[in-house]
């Protein structure tokens, strides 16, 4: 058993049929010595008396808010949560496996630049009685500070018969140099509590590997005289690291109709303009990627050909 | 500790082309190592990230773009002094700081070159003959060093009398390639910045 936060404790249980469970001793936070009784949750049934209560925690029925009283007055609470371990593996029931970029990916993180700010998100089908707490650091043995905000519900989607909820959090490394060469990864730890179930999820990454620039901005078309070609120009996104001559991007320019199966014109360039062939009912799209370290491409920025 | 704006004329910076070749060569070599050593811990997640130039050179700090010198987090540099002459410099416009940057890059290349050559000598003794260093990568390191053209003491190639542990050597190769790729990215960024300034 360990303390998650004040008056909240996590009991780690090997989860299998007829498991013996864990013996837990609760102590009432009071100077009083006698006349103390214990109850669980809203029940008025007295579980025991005395300053300490010894319980055998085997299942979710044994978890919950234990309260010690004296003469009708509440003295203190202890909330017990369960963390299940099945076949030596901690349970991952609360979050959905996003399977990208590999199986058992519960947390996904992205950074728009090298400033040390990044966003992580996760998915669940659970809608109520759910709380998250996020901690982060650079390295684990001698951790350097990363400050994370509160996790918030950022999107809801319908997937078949199920509703899916996306939560996200923003974090900022306390003293980040955009030009630094990372040797220690960022560690992100998410504590998830659903009713009386506790789970924790972790992700480890270098900022350079989770870079995904914002789409290029200010796409403009200029038809070329006596030609079916158009010159398309754009600018670096505002959120990208500066100076741009140091943090350079490369671009992919594509002309395509509405369907992905349609024919297309595609060209890669390090410049902020390109010449392509425009077709009726097609769109010109441009996306960006770090020129020197190939992490993710940005989303497309698009303008219609006409 | 940072790069001044007074730098060579655009498009006239001979090291840019070499640095692009360097990044390409080390990326290809790393990819080859990952594929060939698929049963060894050779991915970014599996290896320890070591920097053989740590406390010996200060490339990131010495080559910091002017715009980032206002960032306190970028300035906790280790002071190091280097020899200053080099053919990548348009000498009239060159300042001491830029020379410091380029000589730091030269020292990095020299240290990696020695490590790679020592390692290749060991790998050539491996009866499995599983992986060797790409001669193109070694040639590209050499070309960039020649373009930088700094005078510095020759670092003797390490020779070892004991029987090499090929497993450890291959893991060390992965560690070295990952670190060198990250340094090659920095070098490419620096050359691009200098070329544009």
């Amino acid at each position: 058993i360990w303390e998650l936060k004040k008056d909240v404790y996590v009991v780690e249980l090997d989860w299998y049929p007829d498991a013996p469970g864990e013996m837990v001793v609760l102590t009432c936070d009071t100077p009083e010595e006698d006349g103390i009784t214990w109850t669980l949750d809203q029940s008025s049934e007295v579980l025991g008396s005395g300053k300490t209560l010894t319980i055998q925690v085997k299942e979710f029925g044994d978890a919950g808010q234990y309260t010690c009283h004296k003469g009708g007055e509440v003295l203190s609470h202890s909330l017990l949560l369960l963390h299940k371990k099945e076949d030596g593996i901690w349970s991952t029931d609360i979050l959905k496996d996003q399977k990208e970029p590999k199986n058992k990916t519960f947390l996904r993180c992205e950074a728009k630049n090298y400033s040390g700010r990044f966003t992580c998100w996760w998915l669940t089908t659970i809608s109520t009685d759910l709380t998250f707490s996020v901690k982060s650091s650079r390295g684990s043995s001698d951790p350097q500070g990363v400050t994370c905000g509160a996790a918030t519900l950022s999107a809801e989607r319908v997937r078949g018969d199920n509703k899916e909820y996306e939560y996200s959090v923003e974090c900022q490394e306390d003293s980040a140099c955009p030009a630094a060469e990372e040797s220690l990864p960022i560690e992100v730890m998410v504590d998830a509590v659903h009713k009386l179930k506790y789970e924790n999820y972790t992700s480890s990454f270098f900022i350079r590997d989770i870079i995904k620039p914002d789409p290029p901005k200010n796409l403009q078309l200029k038809p070329l005289k006596n030609s079916r070609q158009v010159e398309v120009s754009w600018e670096y996104p505002d959120t990208w690291s500066t100076p741009h001559s140091y943090f350079s991007l490369t671009f992919c320019v594509q002309v395509q109709g509405k369907s992905k199966r349609e024919k297309k014109d595609r060209v890669f360039t390090d410049k902020t303009s390109a010449t392509v062939i425009c077709r009726k009912n097609a769109s010109i799209s441009v996306r960006a990627q770090d020129r020197y370290y190939s992490s993710s491409w940005s989303e497309w920025a698009s303008v219609p050909c006409s | 500790r940072n790069l001044p704006v007074a730098t060579p004329d655009p498009g006239m910076f001979p090291c840019l082309h070499h640095s692009q070749n360097l990044l390409r060569a080390v990326s290809n070599m790393l990819q080859k190592a990952r594929q060939t050593l698929e049963f060894y811990p050779c991915t970014s997640e599996e290896i320890d990230h070591e920097d053989i130039t740590k406390d010996k050179t200060s490339t990131v700090e010495a080559c910091l773009p002017l715009e980032l010198t206002k960032n306190e987090s970028c300035l906790n540099s280790r002071e190091t002094s280097f020899i200053t002459n080099g053919s990548c410099l348009a000498s009239r416009k060159t300042s001491f700081m830029m020379a410091l940057c380029l000589s730091s890059i030269y020292e990095d290349l020299k240290m990696y070159q020695v490590e790679f050559k020592t390692m290749n000598a060991k790998l050539l003794m491996d009866p499995k003959r599983q992986i060797f260093l790409d001669q193109n990568m070694l040639a590209v390191i050499d070309e960039l060093m020649q373009a930088l053209n700094f005078n510095s003491e020759t670092v003797p190639q390490k020779s070892s009398l004991e029987e090499p542990d090929f497993y450890k050597t291959k893991i060390k190769l992965c560690i070295l390639l990952h670190a060198f790729r990250i340094r090659a990215v920095t070098i490419d960024r620096v050359m691009s910045y200098l070329n544009a300034s």
Epitope: R228, T250, R261, D265, R266, V267, F268, D270, R279 | -
Partner: antibody, heavy 118, light 107 residues
Framework: QVQLVQSGAEVKKPGSSVKVSCKAS????????LHWVRQAPGQGLEWMGW????????EYAPKFQGRVTITADESTSTAYMELSSLRSEDTAVYYC???????????WGQGTLVTVSS | DIVMTQSPLSLPVTPGEPASISCRAS??????LHWYQQKPGQAPRQLIA???QSISGVPSRFSGSGSGTDFTLTISSLQPEDFATYMC?????????FGQGTKVEIK
């Protein structure tokens, strides 16, 4: 299976014109760009131009501008390349080729040898 | 027009050995570079798109690298069926242009 079948070999006199055909099968004809590329004996490949069969848009290499005409007939899934004012240096194998991507080629015809000789 | 220059023009290789062919563009073309193989009396066949993207159905021994002006096609271990002429093509701008070809011959 996508296939491009070209018309047979031709022998032409200098100053005359030649029209080579290329019939496509497999896949929708207008879903692809069609290119014409030639190869003189023992030489490399030389791109001549492309056509978008969907709308008839064309683009020609400056070297052939004014001498080459590329057309397409959607009803028969056939593309044509006509080269006029032939000279001996036009002796080559002419390939039609196609792709959904405009700027490179994934399927080639078998080639048509055009010999220009007096 | 962008001029594509291949080297060497002829490359004698022992079967089973690796081979590397170089292609250089007269100006920077990013990764807009494609590789083809051609055997005598046959039409070309696509091997690599955009400098390094493999094409389905092409053996994994063929790989491409490069960007800007310098590109390389590598065949990791030459098989008897690989003895042919290899050509690069730029797609950075029209007109599309090809390298003159490199003939890989049996040593």
């Amino acid at each position: 299976q996508v296939q491009l079948v070209q018309s047979g070999a031709e022998v032409k006199k200098p100053g005359s014109s030649v029209k080579v055909s290329c019939k496509a099968s497999g896949g929708t004809f207008s879903d692809y760009y069609l290119h014409w590329v030639r190869q003189a004996p023992g030489q490399g490949l030389e791109w001549m131009g492309w056509i978008d069969p969907e709308n008839g848009d064309t683009e020609y290499a400056p070297k052939f501008q004014g001498r080459v005409t590329i057309t397409a007939d959607e009803s028969t899934s056939t593309a044509y390349m006509e080269l006029s004012s032939l000279r001996s240096e036009d002796t080559a194998v002419y390939y039609c080729a196609r792709n959904k991507e405009l700027r490179y080629i994934d399927v080639w015809g078998q080639g048509t040898l055009v010999t220009v000789s007096s | 027009d962008i001029v594509m220059t291949q080297s060497p023009l002829s490359l004698p290789v022992t079967p089973g050995e690796p081979a590397s062919i170089s292609c250089r563009a007269s100006q920077s073309i990013s990764i807009n570079l494609h590789w083809y193989q051609q055997k005598p009396g046959q039409a070309p066949r696509q091997l690599i798109a955009f400098a390094s993207q493999s094409i389905s159905g092409v053996p994994s021994r063929f790989s491409g690298s490069g960007s800007g002006t310098d590109f390389t096609l590598t065949i990791s271990s030459l098989q008897p069926e690989d003895f042919a002429t290899y050509m690069c093509q730029q797609s950075n701008s029209f007109p599309l242009t090809f390298g003159q070809g490199t003939k890989v011959e049996i040593k």
